[in-house]
Amino acid sequence: DAEFRHDSGYEVHHQKLVFFAEDVGSNKGAIIGLMVGGVVIA
């Protein structure tokens, strides 16, 4: 018995997650960040 299709109602938007590590000098350590949609959040 076939069912009627019901959609979730949400459009899926894909975003690229980019992890990066940047060396900022020998005695300053490193910055590790997470970029979501072009905004650094961590």
């Epitope: 076939a2 069912e3 009627f4 299709r5 019901h6 959609d7 979730s8 109602g9 949400y10």
Partner: antibody, heavy 123, light 112 residues
Amino acid sequence: QVTLKESGPGLVKPTQTLSLTCSFSGFSLSTSGMGVSWIRQPSGKGLEWLAHIYWDDDKQYNPSLKSRLTISKDTSKNQVFLTITSVDPVDTATYYCVRRASSSRYDDQFDYWGQGTPLTVSS
Amino acid sequence: DVVMTQTPLSLPVSLGDPASISCRASQSIVHSNGNTYLEWYLQKPGQSPKLLIYRVSNRFSGVPDRFSGSGSGTDFTLKISRVEAEDVGVYFCFQVTHVPLTFGGGTKLELK
């Protein structure tokens, strides 16, 4: 606001092919979760669901009529079409197009109906 | 096909009185996604049907709160707490779980 309006020939002869058009405004059939059904009602009688077309061009049909029905859409013109082949006097009815919209997760309903277009099948 | 049986066929009611319409499905209309797609419509003479209730108990936008829906599985009820003159017409239940989608035969509400 959302409106739908059906149009058709009004009178067709038995064995002919019927073409109905639903012209709508206030929404787009390219929007995720949107769809349109055709439903008919013989005068003074009950309602019968015929077919449904989804935003992504998926289709579902009433199995008892599937061999005679074709539903299609022109998203750019905001129109949905229904063709019925080999019409018979029992196909005499008012034909409605109806929007089904999904407002949130699996929460959809037939919220807007057209005024209906009457069709008579007679020789 | 899922047969939707509505009772009564005709419902004479006095203004201000409550009214109740029953709708019974020939099999469960619980969808595999967990929802029950049972809807109620009112069709006034010469008009297209208008949505009152969706998913058993949810009032559509603009529908007065005197209308309420309840039920589960195969048995459903539409209640009007106090009938008003504008409520006259034919009420249909409609299942949107199984293909083909099917309507009840209708209940004609009229004033005594």
